[in-house]
């Protein structure tokens, strides 16, 4: 059960309620574990993880990425700018996580867990950011057409897209985790 979704610590019946910071930290680590499992299936199924042709597929994608201006790195750190970027980035990743839903055979449940846990994480972070400026959400129509476009790709491009989404999402979450530990 993902942390934050009524998980019960069986070994510790007297567990205190998780603090906001702990919930966020645990949620990100839970999602990262899920991504690792999905990457394992992707890499076992195809040679995408060793491919040098990633640039071809990346042209079709506009995956969220941390940049210096986002204030999430040690150099130029800005906690408010960074938190907005993390939430905005996660919201932008949602369409790509939806795309992943039909891309796995043995890890179908894991793909769903990553998607649902990300939604929960966004809620946690929005609570943390309640005093910050409004966060812009992606346009549903744009997302729908992007999803259609991605699903219409040939098999090789779909495999590469899956690999790139997982890799980018992992990198984004790792950067987010490091930054959030300071907040």
């Amino acid at each position: 059960v993902p942390p934050g979704e009524d998980s019960k610590d069986v070994a510790a019946p007297h567990r205190q309620p998780l603090t906001s910071s702990e919930r966020i930290d645990k949620q990100i680590r839970y999602i990262l574990d899920g991504i690792s499992a999905l990457r394992k299936e992707t890499c076992n199924k195809s040679n995408m993880c060793e491919s040098s042709k990633e640039a071809l597929a990346e042209n079709n994608l506009n995956l969220p990425k941390m940049a210096e201006k986002d204030g999430c790195f040690q150099s130029g750190f800005n906690e408010e700018t960074c938190l907005v970027k993390i939430i905005t980035g996660l919201l932008e990743f949602e369409v790509y996580l939806e795309y992943l839903q039909n891309r796995f055979e043995s890890s179908e449940e894991q793909a769903r867990a990553v998607q649902m846990s990300t939604k929960v994480l966004i809620q946690f972070l929005q609570k943390k950011a309640k005093n910050l400026d409004a966060i812009t959400t992606p346009d549903p129509t744009t997302n729908a057409s992007l999803l259609t476009k991605l699903q219409a790709q040939n098999q090789w491009l779909q495999d590469m897209t899956t690999h790139l989404i997982l890799r980018s999402f992992k990198e984004f979450l790792q950067s987010s985790l490091r930054a959030l530990r300071q907040m």
Partner: antibody, heavy 119, light 106 residues
Framework: EVQLVESGGGLVQPGGSLRLSCAAS????????MSWVRQAPGKGLEWVAK????????YYSDTVTGRFTFSLDTSKSTAYLQMNSLRAEDTAVYYC????????????WGQGTLVTVSS | DIQLTQSPSSLSASVGDRVTITCSAS?????MYWYQQKPGKAPKLLIY???NLASGVPSRFSGSGSGTDFTLTISSLQPEDFATYYC?????????FGQGTKVEIK
């Protein structure tokens, strides 16, 4: 050299106030969260409070919530602990500590400043 | 709050000895740290996130464990290692510390 220097400790009567300072040098102050940890004479360590790098988020132990306030002046690379309604049990050496970037570890510590609450 | 219990509270050892200090948490913790403190000095970070060696710390120090049980090991005790050692955990706020283990010269 990376350094944290605490000051502002001293003798204060119960119910009184004191403001501790923690001056940072040798590193860029802005990306790091800071904490205060105290140690009563001959006793163990007790975490008191944390502040995020820009001061947007603060966390306090139950023992000091409502009495202590953690703040920053980033232009001076200095952290402050405003201590009000002081009690005898607040008597301790107060250390400020810098959090390791990307982790929760308290990595760099100052030499400490002694606060004595007594009538 | 999460309680940390260190054992032993104190120990006597000789230079070259292998020393093991344990830290038991009242419930499962997310991250564990170990500190060394000498009289009149500030604590010094030795180990972070259970087993990572802090910058500048000799490799004779190592940390292990997960869940509720953690260990600090000094593989070969050196004269400068006689001090008090504290475990500290983070699983959300507050951070909490163990009561300390004093390592003395036999």
């Amino acid at each position: 050299e990376v350094q944290l220097v605490e000051s502002g400790g001293g003798l204060v009567q119960p119910g009184g106030s004191l403001r501790l300072s923690c001056a940072a040098s040798g590193f860029t102050f802005s990306p790091f969260a800071m904490s205060w940890v105290r140690q009563a004479p001959g006793k163990g360590l007790e975490w008191v409070a944390k502040i995020s790098p820009g001061g947007s988020w603060t966390y306090y132990s139950d023992t000091v919530t409502g009495r202590f306030t953690f703040s920053l002046d980033t232009s001076k690379s200095t952290a402050y602990l405003q201590m009000n309604s002081l009690r005898a049990e607040d008597t301790a050496v107060y250390y400020c500590a810098r959090q390791l970037w990307g982790y929760y570890a308290l990595e760099i510590w100052g030499q400490g400043t002694l606060v004595t609450v007594s009538s | 709050d999460i309680q940390l219990t260190q054992s032993p509270s104190s120990l006597s050892a000789s230079v070259g000895d292998r020393v093991t200090i344990t830290c038991s948490a009242s419930i499962s913790v997310s991250y564990m740290y170990w500190y060394q403190q000498k009289p009149g000095k500030a604590p010094k970070l030795l180990i972070y996130d259970m087993s990572n060696l802090a910058s500048g710390v000799p490799s004779r120090f190592s940390g292990s464990g997960s869940g509720t049980d953690f260990t600090l090991t000094i593989s070969s005790l050196q004269p400068e290692d006689f001090a008090t050692y504290y475990c500290m955990q983070w699983s959300g706020y507050p951070y909490t510390f163990g009561q300390g283990t004093k390592v003395e010269i036999k």
